[in-house]
């Protein structure tokens, strides 16, 4: 039975040209995390393997930085970066947990961080 929950940074916004940290946190489970994947729609941005550490997808290596922790930092943001991002926790024995973050990249300085929320 999957008892864990993923807390994410929720709906967030940031300025074009700036950077943003995407964060997820898995709680309420004793399952061992074997790998965390970060995906944008159907594209794999990066993985953090429990044994072998961070691997940044070659197509994103100039604009994506690992961390902090299991989070991911997106740099040099463009309007095209607006959209859904997913953190996918591969665990055993529970299986897979997925968290969702929606990022809006704004032209001006009206960007504000949204509230945190939980996905069971």
């Amino acid at each position: 039975m999957m008892t864990g929950t993923i807390e994410t940074t929720g709906n967030i916004s940031a300025e074009k040209g700036g950077s943003i940290i995407l964060q997820c946190h898995l709680s309420s489970t004793t399952a061992q995390v074997t790998q965390v994947n970060w995906e944008q729609q159907d594209q794999l941005l990066a993985i953090c393997n429990a044994d072998l550490g961070w691997h940044i997808s070659p197509s994103f290596k100039d604009r994506v930085a690992p961390g902090p922790g299991l989070g991911l930092t997106l740099q040099s943001l463009t309007v095209n970066d607006t959209g859904e991002y997913f953190c996918i926790y591969h665990t055993y024995p529970d299986g897979t947990y997925t968290g969702r973050i929606f990022l809006e990249v704004l032209e001006s300085s009206v960007a504000e961080h949204g509230a945190r929320f939980q996905i069971p």
Epitope: N37, L44, I47, N49, D51, L52, G53, P58, Y92, D94
Partner: antibody
Framework: QVQLVQSGAEVKKPGASVKVSCKAS????????ISWVRQAPGQGLEWMGW????????KYAQKLQGRVTMTTDTSTSTAYMELRSLRSDDTAVYYC??????????????????WGQGTMVTVSS | DIQMTQSPSSLSASVGDRVTITCRAS??????LNWYQQKPGKAPKLLIY???SLQSGVPSRFSGSGSGTDFTLTISSLQPEDFATYYC????????FGGGTKVEIK
């Protein structure tokens, strides 16, 4: 085609070191992890550890910690396994093996789809 | 570390027989279980990964099932080239193999 080619057989004295090489071809070396597995004569398979060819990070089996070092040379697409302070019970065939899934498949499965031909290491005085 | 127990350690069978090999994990490993075939003097060959996925190029007479702690490799109709030793391997770090099952000609 995709293959891993290992260095030749070695005979070593107890206390010595051995370094086995594993040259990859036919795929993007840095997109996969390489594991090392050994098999003593007439015995089963033992996982020794693995290395990311992307970033060089390693994880070793607890019983070999401190005696084994795994490295890669991305310029030649070659993985290396060095075992130090050899004992007679290190006599085995040593295999390198590629992880089934590339890092960019999103799932590093810890299953081994491509294997080297094996390198026999004999430790004897 | 997770221990993998394979049974039987050896078996005798005839061409055309249905053969079943079992593997039990000392704790739940979800579907992190792989099966290999090894012939004398050769490297192991991956047959099944993630408990039930058939590796590319492997004949469909091989199948895998199970999850949690109990897993099975089935050869639906044994062929002459199938006489070999079979190993299960769990891929939860640190990875461990079962002791092997030798399939011999009856």
């Amino acid at each position: 085609q995709v293959q891993l080619v290992q260095s030749g057989a070695e005979v070593k004295k107890p206390g010595a070191s051995v370094k086995v090489s594993c040259k990859a071809s036919g795929y993007t070396f840095t997109s996969y992890a390489i594991s090392w597995v050994r098999q003593a004569p007439g015995q089963g398979l033992e996982w020794m550890g693995w290395i990311s060819a992307y970033n060089g990070n390693t994880k070793y089996a607890q019983k070999l910690q401190g005696r084994v070092t795994m490295t890669t040379d991305t310029s030649t697409s070659t993985a290396y396994m060095e075992l130090r302070s050899l004992r007679s019970d290190d006599t085995a065939v040593y295999y390198c093996a590629r992880d089934l899934s590339s890092f960019w498949s999103g799932d590093v499965l810890g299953a081994f789809d491509i294997w080297g031909q094996g390198t026999m290491v004999t430790v004897s005085s | 570390d997770i221990q993998m127990t394979q049974s039987p350690s050896s078996l005798s069978a005839s061409v055309g027989d249905r053969v079943t090999i079992t593997c039990r994990a000392s704790q739940s490993i979800s579907s992190y279980l792989n099966w290999y075939q090894q012939k004398p003097g050769k490297a192991p060959k991956l047959l099944i990964y993630a408990a039930s996925s058939l590796q590319s190029g492997v004949p469909s007479r091989f199948s895998g099932s199970g999850s949690g702690t109990d897993f099975t490799l089935t050869i639906s109709s044994l062929q002459p080239e199938d006489f070999a030793t079979y190993y299960c391997q769990q891929s939860v770090p640190p990875r461990t193999f079962g002791g092997g099952t030798k399939v011999e000609i009856k």
